[in-house]
């Protein structure tokens, strides 16, 4: 019994620096508590972007200062990352852990390459 995690290969952030993607996992057990972590990999450096633990059937709750928001539906998590700039372009990997009841299972997606393009500044207009 393994846990497979699927996520889109590429996502383009909006001009407002918002990127959304779905992280879907095939649960080998009847988990009631799940932890989802988004990791960013760029230039062989890995950083934790955000993490949330949720009870199945309930909403994800990220920390108040988190740049992530999300909703859950069954074995699917809809993640939104805000405040992105061009320098945040990178591979965003979804890590899913089935926390309760035992046994624990780990699943890691292949990553979503998020491209962020900073908007061009508006030219001054003479009126």
């Amino acid at each position: 019994k393994a846990m497979h995690v699927a996520q889109p290969a590429v996502v383009l952030a909006s001009s407002r620096g918002i990127a959304s993607f779905v992280c879907e996992y095939a649960s080998p057990g009847k988990a009631t508590e799940v932890r989802v972590t988004v990791l960013r990999q760029a230039d062989s450096q890995v950083t934790e972007v955000c993490a949330a633990t949720y009870m199945m059937g309930n909403e994800l709750t990220f920390l108040d200062d988190s740049i992530c928001t999300g909703t859950s539906s069954g074995n699917q998590v809809n993640l939104t990352i805000q405040g992105l700039r061009a320098m945040d372009t990178g591979l965003y990997i979804c890590k899913v852990e089935l926390m309760y009841p035992p046994p624990y299972y780990l699943g890691i997606g292949n990553g979503t390459q998020i491209y962020v393009i900073d908007p061009e500044p508006c030219p001054d207009s003479d009126f």
Epitope: E48, P102, Y104
Partner: antibody, heavy 119, light 108 residues
């Protein structure tokens, strides 16, 4: 730099109790699963227990379930292992270990503390 | 529980030689969630490889890991004097997290 320092080991009689502590430094303690791994003299490694992130979820090896309790105090960056009803086969060096970013492998280890259960 | 078997139990080699260590799982280790550790007498284990093939920070490139499913290999391309030690594999895809019994690499 990451540091894990265990304490609390010693000689104890069968059936008695002991509490191990592990003080962590150099990283955000609450962001990592923390584990106890033991090694009997001259033997291999055996995973004992894990306390995940905020401390609410814990998993144990069958060999210690019901006798050992793992806990953590994130405000003190400290991991504990309460060992009750100790047996001779619990004699081992007990290591505190940090789980990795990519999963529960062990990327940093303490120096270990020896627990000897003997009458 | 996933049972890991390591072979050989002892590997006797000379410095400069290539070492090939095997780790076999009783059932498939999902997504190659397998790690390798080195342990020297009187010391704590040290992480070498995670994810079957990713080298941990500060590990020399003479150490490499490969494999998937149930068969994994740790290769030391050219043994240095400090590489003579015991090596353990560990699976971490599901609990309980299990170790192999170890392979001792000693000097011939």
């Amino acid at each position: 730099q990451v540091q894990l320092v265990e304490s609390g080991g010693g000689v104890v009689q069968p059936g008695r109790s002991l509490r191990l502590s592990c003080i962590a430094s150099g990283f955000t303690f609450s962001s990592y699963g923390m584990h106890w791994v033991r090694q009997a003299p001259g033997k291999g490694l055996e995973w004992v227990a894990v306390n995940w992130y905020d401390g609410s979820n814990k998993h144990y090896a069958d060999s210690v379930k019901g006798r050992f309790t793992i806990s953590r105090d994130n405000s003190k960056n400290t991991l504990y292992l309460q060992m009750n009803s100790l047996r001779a086969e619990d004699t081992a060096v007990y290591y505190c270990a940090r789980g990795g970013v990519w999963g529960p492998y062990f990327d940093y280890w303490g120096q270990g503390t020896l627990v000897t259960v003997s009458s | 529980e996933i049972v890991l078997t390591q072979s050989p139990g002892t590997l006797s080699l000379s410095p400069g030689e290539r070492a090939t260590l095997s780790c076999r799982a009783s059932q498939s280790v999902s997504s190659s969630y397998l790690a390798w550790y080195q342990q020297k007498p009187g010391q704590a284990p040290r992480l070498l490889i995670y994810g079957a093939s990713s080298r941990a920070t500060g590990i020399p490139d003479r150490f490499s890991g490969s494999g998937s499913g149930t068969d994994f290999t740790l290769t030391i391309s050219r043994l240095e004097p400090e590489d003579f030690a015991v090596y353990y594999c560990q699976q971490y895809g599901r609990s309980p997290f299990t170790f192999g019994p170890g392979t001792k690499v000693d000097i011939k």
